[in-house]
Interface confidence: low
Amino acid sequence: GELETSDVVTVVLGQDAKLPCFYRGDSGEQVGQVAWARVDAGEGAQELALLHSKYGLHVSPAYEGRVEQPPPPRNPLDGSVLLRNAVQADEGEYECRVSTFPAGSFQARLRLRVLVPPLPSLNPGPALEEGQGLTLAASCTAEGSPAPSVTWDTEVKGTTSSRSFKHSRSAAVTSEFHLVPSRSMNGQPLTCVVSHPGLLQDQRITHILHVSFLAEASVRGLEDQNLWHIGREGAMLKCLSEGQPPPSYNWTRLDGPLPSGVRVDGDTLGFPPLTTEHSGIYVCHVSNEFSSRDSQVTVDVLDPQEDSGKQVDLVSAS
């Protein structure tokens, strides 16, 4: 006869490990008892359990409550046991010794491998601002046994670097994603992907990128200067910019206070029926926590009685 077992049994942390040991004997042979022990090199053998054909299962105190026989129906030649709730410390070599009648004793060894699925964590880097050089966007760390794979899934252009720490029973992997911040990255997902044999599917942690910026400001509303004439109603100037965080707008007049009746509504400056008093230089000031921008325009209100048109100057400054 001979013993049938596995060279390696792989189980995920917390699962039950079946340690197989089956005696394939000739007709009429019987198994008297099966002894299980842990036999890691450098340590004395530590008995787990004894399966006796007459007296049943005896579990050693160190494994009390953790070693069981597989559920029925059971073959009398099957000496397999279940190790409940496998932990990292269970990883190692195990031996089953089978006493048979009349063939004698047999023994076989197997290695138990306990996979520790990683618990990844993603840490965003410092605040991203347009104009910075290569900057850490995020780092992702995962620790497990064996070492997990940490990669990045994103449409954003960047560079990655990884490092690994080997521990006695596990390995930690940290991957960093660096990029040159630009406004186009705002709202883009940066996903850390962790692969590991102990996971049914890859674990993914997504970080949404936020890049602080402020676009140049420009003023709309003066495209057709002929519309800016005395008496015109509904004239308005609109300040255009965009930023992250969203900017606030402020209107001033360079050559004096805003005329009475002019309404400021955020990015829009609304005029009452135009008079020559509304002629002047208007400044839109755009700001957020990152930066500030100015754009100024010269408004010249035309008198319809006059034939000659007047030029309009647009000046942007930041």
């Epitope: 618990l119 964590s121 760390t141 620790e143 670097s161 490092r163 720490f165 521990h167 006695s168 596990s170 930690a172 940290t174």
Partner: antibody
């Protein structure tokens, strides 16, 4: 306020033993790896040993491996260093220090040491 | 083990001076470097971590730079309380190792 207070230093003969303690307060002790660092008189800093937040992983400098044992009691917020077979070259001020962060409590990940105790002097001499 | 070499071993400077200390690693350690300040009879104090990040509560006159194997600690304008010994430490891998120290003395 984070505080680390070492105790247990003193004069001991070569071959003798000593147990250092470090009482921690002001932070969640079990969340942080802890380290021992020593400084011989007039010399620089030498990392001695570290232990993960849970106590499951320990690391030692080659110079103390097999002689020193680091441990912690998270219920008492206390870190220990058991020093056996002491030698003259172990004479130093021993500092306990908190690792700045810990990724996982069951493994040790070297990080900067952001809080240090005041130190306790260990003198090994006959 | 990774060896950390600081230079100079000591330097003399006056209040207001700009002081630079360098630290070289025997192999690449990315940005996993910390700087500490130690005054006589006192425990070390963390100044800089991750090569260039300022620890909370540390004055902005201290700054760090570098990556790979070469790193620098700069004190932009030396103050009386800055006369001390400065150590670099790699936290890239175990065992974490310190430089031999640089003593900043009053000229």
């Amino acid at each position: 306020e984070v505080q680390l207070v070492e105790s247990g230093g003193g004069l001991v003969q070569p071959g003798g033993s000593l147990r250092l303690s470090c009482a921690a307060s002001g932070f969640t002790f079990s969340s942080y790896a802890m380290s021992w660092v020593r400084q011989a008189p007039g010399k620089g800093l030498e990392w001695v040993s570290a232990i993960s937040g849970s106590g499951g992983s320990t690391y030692y400098a080659d110079s103390v491996k097999g002689r020193f044992t680091i441990s912690r009691d998270n219920s008492k917020n206390t870190l220990y260093l058991q020093m056996n077979s002491l030698r003259a070259e172990d004479t130093a001020v021993y500092y306990c220090a908190r690792d700045r962060s810990d990724v996982y409590s069951y493994s040790y990940f070297p990080t900067p040491l952001d809080y240090w105790g005041q130190g306790t002097l260990v003198t090994v001499s006959s | 083990d990774i060896q950390m070499t600081q230079s100079p071993s000591s330097l003399s400077a006056s209040v207001g001076d700009r002081v630079t200390i360098t630290c070289r690693a025997s192999q690449g350690i990315s940005s996993y470097l910390a700087w500490y300040q130690q005054k006589p009879g006192k425990a070390p104090k963390l100044l800089i971590y991750a090569a260039s990040s300022l620890q909370s509560g540390v004055p902005s006159r201290f700054s760090g730079s570098g990556s790979g194997t070469d790193f620098t600690l700069t004190i932009s304008s030396l103050q009386p309380e800055d006369f001390a010994t400065y150590y670099c430490q790699q936290h890239y891998t175990t065992p974490p190792t310190f430089g031999q120290g640089t003593k900043v003395e009053i000229k």
